[in-house]
């Protein structure tokens, strides 16, 4: 009765178990009773990343600059090329097949997490006591100016988009206060 299974680094062919080809090599010919599996290294710009019986190696991924892509890690005979995005852009998917511009946080929102090559900007609403008056991919919410520390008073309350406006102390009240 011929075998129905093989060990993990083997494959079943013609009722016998042949050795798989190592990563970085492709299958040229199956083994026989008297000859081992014949494998050949993948060519330039090709790879195979597992023990395999593939007759063709896979082409390395092309990082298309027209799509905002650049090479993060050059491929080898055993690994694919890893693409990432140009500065200011991030991948649209895990496979990083194309890029989009990092989004900016609108006024009233600040940057919670700066974008990376693989993740977009994360914005957060400015809480009470903080503001952002610009659209930015880098700026966090800023704290309102503390008028008191400058020996000034609030003339106009701050919002999530604007800072407080400080003004001089009322001289009369200031005078009465000291007498």
């Amino acid at each position: 009765e011929p075998p129905t299974a093989c060990r993990e680094k083997q494959y079943l062919i013609n009722s016998q178990c042949c050795s798989l080809c190592q990563p970085g090599q492709k299958l040229v010919s199956d083994c026989t009773e008297f000859t081992e599996t014949e494998c050949l290294p993948c060519g330039e710009s090709e790879f195979l990343d597992t023990w395999n019986r593939e007759t063709h190696c896979h082409q390395h991924k092309y990082c298309d600059p027209n799509l905002g892509l650049r090479v993060q890690q050059k491929g080898t005979s055993e690994t694919d090329t890893i693409c990432t995005c140009e500065e200011g852009w991030h991948c649209t998917s895990e496979a990083c097949e194309s890029c989009v511009l990092h989004r900016s946080c609108s006024p009233g929102f600040g940057v919670k997490q700066i974008a990376t090559g693989v993740s977009d900007t994360i914005c957060e609403p400015c809480p009470v006591g903080f503001f952002s008056n610009v659209s930015s991919a880098f700026e966090k919410c800023h704290p309102w100016t503390s008028c008191e520390t400058k020996d000034l008073v609030v003339q106009q309350a701050g919002t999530n988009k604007t800072d407080v406006v400080c003004g001089p102390q009322d001289r009369l009240r200031h005078h009465h206060h000291h007498h």
Partner: antibody
Framework: EVQLLESGGGLVRPGGSLRLSCAAS????????MNWVRQAPGKGLEWVSY????????DYADSVKGRFTVSRDNSKNLLYLQMNSLRAEDTAVYYC????????????????????WGQGTMVTVSS | DIQLTQSPSSLTASVGDRVTITCRSS??????LAWYQQKPGKPPKLLIY???SLEGGVPSRFSGSGSGTDFTLTISSLQPEDFATYYC?????????FGQGTKLEIK
């Protein structure tokens, strides 16, 4: 230290059942293929069964097919052999053995061997 | 199933002798053959894998050769600790099979 330790052997009546265990230590058990090999008193070695690292693939000697079941629990580093419908001819020392794939990337196709063996557990089938 | 036949079944030799044990397969198994040494009451110990590669820690007096159907295990100069039973095993396909063993005894 890399070790395999079998347990669960003993005296059992013909037609009875027994479950052998093999506890692995000192290596990443879940990365290795495993085997059971037995040796009847005064006789040679007989391969009994094989299980892949994930437990997905199993194979058996014709003499035990349909009666024995090999399994593994990688979370507990344990290998098992469930033996049913036992016969007198199943009397033997049962060893668990680790399959290893020897490979040198500059070399050819690599080769298998059983590089780590337990001390064995005795199974006696007798009325 | 692939049958392995070892010869001789038993062998008497002296310390310092060169000893050769052969293993013949019923069909071609390329170089998918291993050799083991077993002493009484002990589990087998791997000596050779891939027909000719020496397992780590095994003395260089042990060597293996052959491919296809005919294989040999050679001990170049017998030492007292080499007296044991030797088995060949094919790992080319399932069911994996062992030779019947060769018992090496002291003269």
């Amino acid at each position: 230290e890399v070790q395999l330790l079998e347990s669960g052997g003993g005296l059992v009546r013909p037609g009875g059942s027994l479950r052998l265990s093999c506890a692995a230590s000192g290596f990443t058990f879940g990365s290795y293929e495993m085997n059971w090999v037995r040796q009847a008193p005064g006789k040679g070695l007989e391969w009994v069964s094989y299980i892949s690292s994930s437990g997905e693939t199993t194979d058996y000697a014709d003499s035990v097919k349909g009666r024995f079941t090999v399994s593994r629990d990688n979370s507990k580093n344990l290998l098992y052999l469930q033996m049913n419908s036992l016969r007198a001819e199943d009397t033997a020392v049962y060893y668990c053995a680790r399959d290893v794939f020897f490979f040198d990337s500059s070399g050819d196709n690599g080769a298998y061997g059983m590089d780590v063996w337990g001390q064995g557990t005795m199974v006696t089938v007798s009325s | 199933d692939i049958q392995l036949t070892q010869s001789p079944s038993s062998l008497t030799a002296s310390v310092g002798d060169r000893v050769t044990i052969t293993c013949r397969s019923s069909q071609g198994i390329r170089s998918s053959l291993a050799w083991y040494q077993q002493k009484p009451g002990k589990p087998p110990k791997l000596l050779i894998y891939g027909a000719s590669s020496l397992e780590g820690g095994v003395p260089s007096r042990f060597s293996g050769s052959g491919s296809g159907t005919d294989f040999t295990l050679t001990i170049s100069s017998l030492q007292p600790e080499d007296f044991a039973t030797y088995y060949c095993q094919q790992l080319a396909s399932f069911p994996s099979t062992f030779g019947q063993g060769t018992k090496l005894e002291i003269k």
